[in-house]
Interface confidence: low
Amino acid sequence: WLKGDLKLFICYVESLFKNLFRNYNYKVHLLYVLPEVLEDSPLVPQKGSFQMVHCNCSVHECCECLVPVPTAKLNDTLLMCLKITSGGVIFQSPLMSVQPINMVKPDPPLGLHMEITDDGNLKISWSSPPLVPFPLQYQVKYSENSTTVIREADKIVSATSLLVDSILPGSSYEVQVRGKRLDGPGIWSDWSTPRVFTTQDV
């Protein structure tokens, strides 16, 4: 997926042969090619046209491969394949193609804020993360905690605020928000830091 700052395409690789590779030293590289190389060449690029990055395989039994993708190329197709070297043997994956724009994972929304409106509703508002190249949809997750009762709800909205009516007095509301591309494929951001708002008792 593409980080929220749009500078790095992160490819997480999870091997189906965990046990095999656990017993051997192995190295993983990601070979990729950006579309400008392909303009005057066949559909399958030549071996020499690929760039190669080393993948860090110490992360949660996955490998993290960082591919620099220029912002201007987000809509283009990125071709890539994995090369795994273990015990003198080279394994190579089939060629994969992705559009980075479809794989953007935004940063979490910012400035989560709650207030009671004049008509007694709870207004939840937040700011869109910076640098996102398209409008986002947001998932608002909130729980209502009244003495021994906890109720949870979530709502998908395209605005950067949500009005919750019929709120309970003397209750606390814990809210988190995350974002994803509105009008196409994408990856949900991490949840924002939870905020808690307590309504006054009657």
Epitope: S146, V149, A153, D154, S166
Partner: antibody, heavy 122, light 108 residues
Amino acid sequence: QVQLVESGGGVVQPGRSLRLSCAASGFTFSTYGMHWVRQAPGKGLEWVSVISYDESNKYYADSVKGRFTISRDNSKNALYLQMNSLRNEDTAVYYCARDRPFGLVTGWFDPWGQGTLVTVSS
Amino acid sequence: DIQMTQSPSSLSASVGDRVTITCRASQSISSYLNWYQQKPGKAPKLLIYAASSLQSGVPSRFSGSGSGTDFTLTISSLQPEDFATYYCQQSYSTPPITFGQGTRLEIK
């Protein structure tokens, strides 16, 4: 203003079917859970069914489970109750009622429609 | 299922009286208790939600109290338009949502 209007009631024989509708206006229908509550003549209120705002959750009273189906069409601001295999004891005024918004199903009912009478009789 | 029991089933009172209706739950329902008023031939109307919160537009002579299993609806000074049937309803353990059997308030 917020308004709920039920329709579709009438006299029907035992074992037959009937479909009730509830037309909503004056609020963003697609964000609210909706209920059906009934009241037999001279009796108290009995909850029948609820549907969440996005149709992901539907629940029924044991007395109607397997016979009644709740549904909604958010594009038409409409709530429905399909009643099959009707029995004499289903005779009642049927009310639709709005719940709390955004998935907080099973809060309180406000407002209610005016009700539609279903009479099951041979 | 949680059973809701109202008392009394009916009561007679005069205009200006202070009236109290009680509702008891078969198990603790915290503050998830609502009160409705229903007049003959009409739909019920929400009066009190969350045990003690007055619904918008409802006169302040209506009040609710209680928590856990025992709840009360109080009308501080009965008005002619208050003669109706009153229902409590729990929204703690649902579904099913359960109502009390109703309390009929009549003119003495």
